[in-house]
């Protein structure tokens, strides 16, 4: 089955510059399929922009200036690139790559989409470091004792742009754990967001990781925030009457 | 030009109560196209749900049902037993891939329908309230309450800043909430919650301990940048 990954969750550009958005295709040979690019502007319908077919033929949507978008395909890295020229405010949108994926049954196809890249246009120069700054909160003793569970909270502050993805994993496991999160909030010129994870008592002695994807992470890799194991056996309790 | 128009911009649904989304086609006969449905969840993930001819995305067949009403020129998507995971924006889209002749393999989308999920009506439940701290940062965790209306107050004489609470549906179908703030005297901050005409304090849940083993790390400690993406 074809799978699409868009490594950039956001791309921030200044006016009239060129933006390049990437889409990595796996599970299918990129030179044996067509890759499509769509955009979703705020409050508008998702619109087809351009496609590159298996034989390299490029098709551009007729209602859009032909020089605005360019599409490329690099078989060696199994990547398709959408180039957006001369970026302007009207180009603020989420850009999705997509492909038709054949189902097991002959003749049945579905179009699958990548996770999208949000193009952000800014006219201000921000501080050098606008990556998310983490603060960790460990479970309160009261919660672990009374509820036989513990909540970890991962606070991320002073980041720009506002596009951020947070998920949680247990150490030595690639399973994404069910977490909850607040809305992204504006604080002066930057943003903050928090996410929390509640785990049962039996998991409190394991290390947990809050994994953060952001455009301005150092070296362009996901930031991993380590939550150490919690010792619950050393606590005696005498809860007040409820 | 062909246009796909959703019946509603927003559809509130209750957990477990079936819901129906409709999308009408303007300017063309719906029978000349294949209809698709997608869901966009938080973080912009666009997931395929259904395509005409009984094709469902992984994990959707049991809880979703797609249909076409040729007479009314509209597409229908039923969510048979909604859960909190079904919250998101739902899009209908059409194409003519494989119909022969001058086919188009691009999708034409309609505007999204925002589906908001609410817990089903249930007996009122009082929240548990816990405080978590790190440096000047304080978080008030409010767990497992119903109904949704709640006021969370972090009590301090030296407030730096406070943020609006996040209120979400818990896995058990009630509500959870977190309110964050920064305070100069974070050690003395407590949390009081007004819910269902009652007040619940974090101090009601405090425990006595003989240990300092359960410690908090310093701010921004335990952060690493791995080599893998």
């Amino acid at each position: 089955a074809g799978h699409l990954e868009q490594p950039q969750i956001s791309s921030t550009k200044t006016l009239s510059k060129t933006a390049r958005l990437e889409c990595v295709v796996s599970g299918i040979t990129i030179s044996a399929t067509s890759v499509y690019w769509y955009r979703e502007r705020p409050g508008e319908v998702i619109q087809f922009l351009v496609s590159i077919s298996y034989d390299g033929t490029v098709r551009k949507e007729s209602g859009i200036p032909s020089g605005k978008f360019e599409v490329d395909r690099i078989p060696e890295t199994s990547t398709s690139t959408l180039t957006i020229h001369n970026v302007e405010k009207q180009d603020i949108a989420t850009y999705y790559c997509a492909l038709w994926e054949a189902q097991q049954e002959l003749g049945k196809k579905i179009k699958v989409f990548g996770p999208g890249t949000k193009l952000i246009i800014t006219d201000k120069q921000l501080d050098a470091d606008v990556s998310p700054k983490p603060t960790i909160f460990l479970p309160s003793i009261a919660e672990t004792k009374l509820q036989k569970a513990g909540t970890y909270l991962c606070l991320l502050e002073k980041f720009f742009p506002d596009v951020i993805k947070i998920h949680w994993e247990e150490k030595k496991s690639n399973t994404i754990l069910g977490s909850q999160e607040g809305n992204t909030m504006k604080t002066n010129d930057t943003y903050m967001k928090f996410s929390w994870l509640t785990v049962p008592e039996k998991s409190l002695d394991k290390e947990h990781r809050c994994i953060v994807r952001h455009e301005n992470n150092k070296n362009g890799v996901d930031q991993e925030i380590i939550f150490p194991p919690i010792k619950t056996d050393v606590i005696t309790m005498d809860p007040k009457d409820n | 030009a062909i246009e796909l128009v959703p019946e509603h911009q927003t559809v509130p649904v209750s957990i477990g109560v079936p819901a129906t989304l409709r999308c009408s086609m303007k300017g063309e006969a719906i029978g000349n196209y294949y209809i698709n449905w997608y869901r966009k969840t938080q973080g912009n993930t666009m997931t395929f749900i259904y395509r005409e001819k009984d094709i469902y995305g992984p994990g959707f067949k049991d809880n979703f049902q797609g249909d076409i009403d040729i007479a009314k020129n509209l597409a229908v998507l039923k969510i048979l037993a909604p859960s909190e995971r079904d919250e998101g924006s739902y899009y209908c889209a059409c194409d003519t891939l494989g119909m022969g002749g001058e086919y188009t393999d691009k999708l034409i989308f309609g505007k999204g329908t925002r589906v908001t999920v609410e817990p089903r009506s249930q007996p009122h439940t009082k929240p548990s309230v816990f405080v978590m701290k790190n440096g000047t940062n304080v978080a008030c965790l409010v767990k497992e309450f119903y109904p949704k209306d709640i006021r969370i107050n972090l009590v301090s004489s030296k407030k730096i800043t406070e943020f609006d609470p996040a209120i979400v549906i818990s896995p058990s179908g009630k509500y959870n909430a977190v309110k964050l703030g920064k305070y100069e005297d974070s050690n003395s901050v407590t949390c009081s919650v007004q819910h269902d005409n009652k007040t619940v304090h974090s101090t009601d849940f405090e425990v006595k301990t003989d240990s300092t083993d359960h410690v908090k790390p310093k701010e921004t400690e335990n952060t690493k940048q791995p080599s893998k993406s």
């Epitope: 060129t18 590159i52 390299g56 490029v58 007729s62 859009i64 200036p65 032909s66 020089g67 605005k68 360019e70 599409v71 490329d72 395909r73 690139t81 180039t83 020229h85 001369n86 302007e88 009207q90 | -």
Partner: antibody, heavy 118, light 112 residues
């Protein structure tokens, strides 16, 4: 400064092919489209097509499809236009010209004269 | 394909007088998203490549005298030379760059 330097004049027999080069300097070659426009003596300007050197993608005027091939060599910032099956009505000055994205053509080469005669 | 039609084919104007050249496109070259008309005007003198005068239908290229102005929107456009100078004798072309590129038929401007 921006320069587009084209190869010299060519005289060709009908049925032959001609390949004209266009060397770019003073700008980022891979970020601009290179267009080819021709002009027969006393006639107007006719857009033949364009290449995007960043990807090698080509877009041809329907009239020349099958007869024209546009290529590029990014290592030497040079674009090429080859026109095959030449006939007398292909006698013209051939210009390369650049444009950025959805901006218009803003800079032209000096032109290459191609004469097709038996 | 978008077809560009210019009128008149040729024009003779006295020095210091106004010259007006018209251009019509077979379909709109106005992109509603940015409200820009993808239309340019060029001047070409014998033995030289064309020179860009106006883009976005009305924006003068730097270094172009302000006697040159462009107007119009959608499908109908005009190039105006407010006070003709001897060095303005040339052929003028309109060009759409909304869908690739197409040039107009050209207008030869001479001194009366």
């Amino acid at each position: 400064q921006v320069q587009l330097v084209q190869s010299g004049a060519e005289v060709k027999k009908p049925g032959a092919s001609v390949k004209v080069s266009c060397k770019a300097s003073g700008f980022t070659f891979t970020d601009h489209y290179i267009n080819w426009v021709r002009q027969a003596t006393g006639q107007g300007l006719e857009w033949m097509g364009q290449i995007y050197p960043g990807s090698g993608n080509t877009y041809y005027n329907q009239k020349f499809k099958g007869r024209v091939t546009m290529t590029r060599d990014t290592s030497i910032s040079t674009a090429y236009m080859e026109l095959s099956s030449l006939r007398s009505e292909d006698t013209a000055v051939y210009y390369c010209a650049r444009n950025y994205g959805d901006y218009t053509i803003d800079f032209w080469g000096q032109g290459t004269s191609v004469t097709v005669s038996s | 394909d978008i077809v560009m039609t210019q009128s008149p084919d040729s024009l003779a104007v006295s020095l210091g007088e106004r010259a007006t050249i018209n251009c019509k496109s077979s379909q709109s070259v106005l992109y509603s998203s940015n409200n820009k008309n993808y239309l340019a005007w060029y001047q070409q003198k014998p033995g030289q490549p064309p020179k860009l005068l106006i883009y976005w239908a009305s924006t003068r290229e730097s270094g172009v005298p302000d006697r040159f102005s462009g107007s119009g929107s959608g499908t109908d456009f005009t190039l105006t030379i407010s006070s003709l100078q001897a060095e303005d004798v040339a052929v003028y072309y309109c060009q759409q760059y909304y869908r690739y590129h197409t040039f107009g038929t050209g207008t030869k401007l001479e001194i009366k």
